[in-house]
């Protein structure tokens, strides 16, 4: 029997150097296109292969981006957030929130062929 799934929320400061194809990730969210119900925050939807974010390795799909170069991303229209990233300069500091899935209680045996292995 599997236990309850909880989430561990952590924050991290990630410094990226803009590459030839930008910062190397796509975002979703904003006050005009909420990605998470009742949350107008900005989330990472895709990490581009061999882009700046992928090569750094810390930013993950599903991470929430709290600020860019100290600029809070709360209550922004989607395009305002896009343009903040686009004009953020060469060295970009991101404050991000990771949401890690953790399992409480007994964990069931992983059978052969389990794709999560």
């Amino acid at each position: 029997m599997n236990g309850r799934v909880d989430y561990l929320v952590t924050e991290e400061e990630i410094n990226l150097t803009r590459g030839p194809s930008g910062l190397g990730f796509n975002i979703v969210g904003g006050t005009d296109q909420q990605y998470v119900s009742n949350d107008s925050g900005i989330y990472v939807s895709r990490i581009k292969e061999n882009g700046a974010a992928a090569l750094d390795g810390r930013l993950q799909e599903g991470d929430k981006i709290l600020s860019v170069n100290g600029q809070d991303l709360k209550n922004l229209l989607h395009q305002d957030a896009v343009d903040l990233f686009r004009n953020a300069g060469y060295a970009v500091s991101l404050r991000v929130q990771h949401r890690l899935q953790v399992q409480n209680g007994p964990i069931g045996h992983r059978g052969e062929g389990d794709p999560s292995g």
Epitope: L76, D80, D83, N87
Partner: nanobody, 124 residues
Framework: EVQLVESGGGLVQAGGSLRLSCAVS??????MGWFRQAPGKEREFVAA????????VYVDSVKGRVTISRDNAKNTVYLEMNSLKPEDTAVYYC????????????????????WGQGTQVTVS
């Protein structure tokens, strides 16, 4: 989707007045500009206003006759034009800065990332 929709253009006699409006959606807190393009001529800067509304700049040829203003609650920018001259005849375009809460305003077309379709002003 970002949209800038101009209105208020038309035919007016020399010496008359017009008030152009530009309704903005999809972006906020942008420095805004008005440009114009007469037939066979380059698009030229007319006026700009900062995102907060506390700073404006005008091309010399319209100073004293034109006022740019904004209502951030309505996300609308205005261009009040008085003492109109035949040489003011052009299509007038509203434009929004490509940067969110940018510091400087200015006449450079390169600063403006989003454009409306334009409204025709004809001074006879």
């Amino acid at each position: 989707e970002v949209q800038l929709v101009e209105s208020g253009g038309g035919l007016v006699q020399a010496g008359g007045s017009l008030r152009l409006s530009c309704a903005v959606s999809g972006v906020s807190f942008r420095n805004m500009g008005w440009f114009r393009q007469a037939p066979g001529k380059e698009r030229e800067f007319v006026a700009a206003i900062s995102w907060s509304g506390d700073s404006t700049v005008y091309v010399d040829s319209v100073k004293g006759r034109v006022t740019i203003s904004r209502d951030n609650a309505k996300n609308t920018v205005y261009l009040e034009m008085n003492s109109l001259k035949p040489e003011d005849t052009a299509v007038y375009y509203c434009a929004a800065d490509g940067r969110f809460r940018a510091g400087q305003i200015g006449p450079s077309l390169g600063l403006y990332h989003y454009w409306g379709q334009g409204t025709q002003v004809t001074v006879s």
